[in-house]
């Protein structure tokens, strides 16, 4: 199709080489098409970015995204050629930064409903470059945490080194929806609730003599509880002795509850003690079996192919640890009579 009639928008993604970050393009179709193609909907805070459901079909994306090769080749279908770019209804989500994302991206309605819709498309010229090392060291992260129940703020990473006074007007989106009532480089949240979690996008305009660009940054905001003050507690095994049958396989499960920590480095190991010897056992990886806002339950199993007489003389020890301290639970095997 002819893209010469598409409206054009220039965007700049200055990514940090110090951290992982994502980027989002919105298909800002001109009205009135936008209203019947991109109805914004609400998702739970964990689902990001917002789905933008289609009026006629629940399954089809509303818009089709293309990338225009710089050499003049035909338009490329994003889904087929770029696995690190996810098409999510009316948004295009870049999972990894890099100058190779620089290029022109075109979106248009998936279904043409009227002759007028044929020319309804948006061309986004995206320039991607690493942030210069000269930019301030304390720039805001692309992953920001808000402590539930307290006051917090969300800063626009590309503007966090500027004072509120010198900052340009900022356009904010949350989960794909415009936050029209907030226009400064920092959003203050007087009391943090779970619903403040989500994907925030901040845009501001940067102009030079030749042209004007929208500088965009994406911030993943997580609402968290305060770090635990407790060491982990072992939920299973509860008993210190376990009745077993000789010659049969045996799995002993260790389950422990770890309180929330912003920097979470849980340790869970199985040891065997035999007389004066003690060694760590190679066992399957630990797995998270339940995760909530306040804590996480982690399980790790020790597997014996068959229980031997020697195992009855040994003590099996589950060891768990977080930044506060450690807890152990010992299990002695006893032959079933």
């Amino acid at each position: 199709f002819n893209i010469s009639g598409c409206s054009t928008k220039k965007l700049l993604w200055a990514y940090s080489t110090r951290s992982e970050e994502e980027f989002i393009l919105f298909c800002d179709l001109p009205e009135p098409q936008k209203s019947h193609f991109c109805h914004r909907s609400q998702l739970s805070p964990t689902q990001v970015p917002d789905h933008l459901p289609f009026t006629d079909s629940k399954d089809l994306p509303d818009v089709q995204w293309y990338r225009q090769p710089s050499n003049g080749d035909p338009l490329e279908d994003i889904r087929k050629s770029y696995p690190h770019i996810i098409q999510d209804k009316c948004t295009l989500r870049f999972l990894t930064p890099g100058v190779n994302n620089t290029g022109s991206y075109i979106c248009r309605p998936k279904m043409i409903k009227s002759p007028y819709d044929v020319a309804c498309c948006v061309k986004m010229i995206l320039e991607v470059k690493p942030q210069s090392n000269a930019s301030c060291e304390n720039s805001a992260s692309h992953k920001q945490d808000l402590l539930l129940g307290s006051t917090g703020s969300i800063s626009c990473p590309s503007l966090s080194c500027q004072s509120d006074a010198q900052s340009p007007e900022v356009t904010w989106y949350k989960n794909g929806k415009l936050l029209s009532m907030t226009r400064s480089n920092r959003i203050v949240v007087d009391e943090v609730y779970i619903y403040h979690q989500g994907t925030y996008v901040c845009d501001y305009t940067q102009s030079d003599t030749a042209s004007s660009w929208t500088v965009r940054a994406v911030v993943q905001v997580r609402t968290i509880v305060g770090d635990t003050k407790l060491k982990p507690d072992i939920l299973d095994p509860v008993e210190s002795t376990l009745e077993v049958e000789l010659g049969k396989p045996l799995t002993i499960s260790c389950k422990a509850r770890f309180g929330f920590e912003r920097v979470f480095n849980p340790v869970m190991k199985w040891y065997i003690k035999d007389a004066d010897l003690e060694w760590e056992v190679s066992v399957p990886e630990a797995k998270s079996i339940k995760s909530t806002l306040k804590d996480e339950i982690i399980e790790r199993n020790i597997i014996l192919e068959k229980v031997t007489q020697r195992d009855l003389r040994r003590t099996f020890v589950c060891f768990v640890q977080n930044s506060i301290g450690n807890t152990t639970q010992s299990v002695q095997l006893k032959e079933k009579r």
């Epitope: 209203s35 019947h36 109805h39 914004r40 909907s41 609400q42 459901p53 009026t55 969300i154 904010w172 949350k174 929806k177 936050l179 029209s180 009532m181 907030t182 226009r183 400064s184 959003i187 203050v188 949240v189 007087d190 009391e191 943090v192 609730y193 619903y195 403040h196």
Partner: antibody, heavy 123, light 107 residues
Framework: QVQLVQSGAEVKKPGASVRVSCKAS????????MHWVRQAPGQGLEWMGI????????TYAQKFQGRVTMTRDTSTSTVYMELSSLRSEDTAVYYC????????????????WGQGTTVTVSS | DIRMTQSPSSLSASVGDRVTITCRAS??????LNWYQQKPGKAPKLLIY???SLQSGVPSRFSGSGSGTDFTLTMSSLQPEDFATYYC?????????FGGGTKVEIK
């Protein structure tokens, strides 16, 4: 408890302006957006616009654009709505209503309402 | 603008009746729908937000359901104090818009 107290009834001539105040108490004034809604006699509810008390940012319904101005005074926790170039069809009860969730977020529900201010426009 | 259409515009019911009011949006609004009750000479009162969440202090006989374009408010057993006008309102996008109202009268 959370309360919104509005100014008293007004009678205005066509072409004049009216300014209605809404004083908030019992909560952190800057944490919640404030809506203005009006209701003509015997009619339904009509949303006029919203103000963010923290920055003073506003969004108005297209119908009132150019005629309505919403402002706030954080020192007195008061929001104001001024409507100019009044006509007879602006005769209505004007309500301020607090947004139900701490900003910034989507709009949810208006959980606390003022008692209403009757504005009569008559020559 | 998103148009909200309520039906019926009025209904007569008796104490103890189960009453259902419907609201239809002109486009999908996900679950961004609220219900209000208004009595003559009084300000509206929020009953339900997010289509189905009961506002604090509202009796459990009120319930809301729906998503997308079609929504309902149900009063499981009508009480004398429930005779009033009910409005739906979308908070999906500005301008926020209300339905025309449903007047619930005593039979």
């Amino acid at each position: 408890q959370v309360q919104l107290v509005q100014s008293g009834a007004e009678v205005k001539k066509p072409g004049a302006s009216v300014r209605v105040s809404c004083k908030a108490s019992g909560y952190t004034f800057t944490s919640y957006y404030m809506h203005w809604v009006r209701q003509a006699p015997g009619q339904g509810l009509e949303w006029m616009g919203i103000i963010n008390p923290r920055g003073g940012y506003t969004t108005y319904a297209q119908k009132f654009q150019g005629r309505v101005t919403m402002t706030r005074d954080t020192s007195t926790s008061t929001v104001y709505m001024e409507l100019s170039s009044l006509r007879s069809e602006d005769t209505a009860v004007y309500y301020c209503a607090k947004e139900g969730r701490v900003s910034p977020t989507d709009y949810y529900g208006m959980d606390v309402w003022g008692q209403g201010t009757t504005v009569t426009v008559s020559s | 603008d998103i148009r909200m259409t309520q039906s019926p515009s009025s209904l007569s019911a008796s104490v103890g009746d189960r009453v259902t009011i419907t609201c239809r949006a002109s486009q999908s609004i996900s679950s961004y729908l609220n219900w209000y009750q208004q009595k003559p000479g009084k300000a509206p009162k929020l009953l339900i937000y997010d289509a189905s969440s009961l506002q604090s202090g509202v009796p459990s006989r009120f319930s809301g359901s729906g998503s997308g374009t079609d929504f309902t408010l149900t009063m499981s057993s009508l009480q004398p104090e429930d005779f009033a006008t009910y409005y739906c309102q979308q908070s999906y996008s500005t301008p926020l818009t209300f339905g025309g109202g449903t007047k619930v009268e005593i039979k």
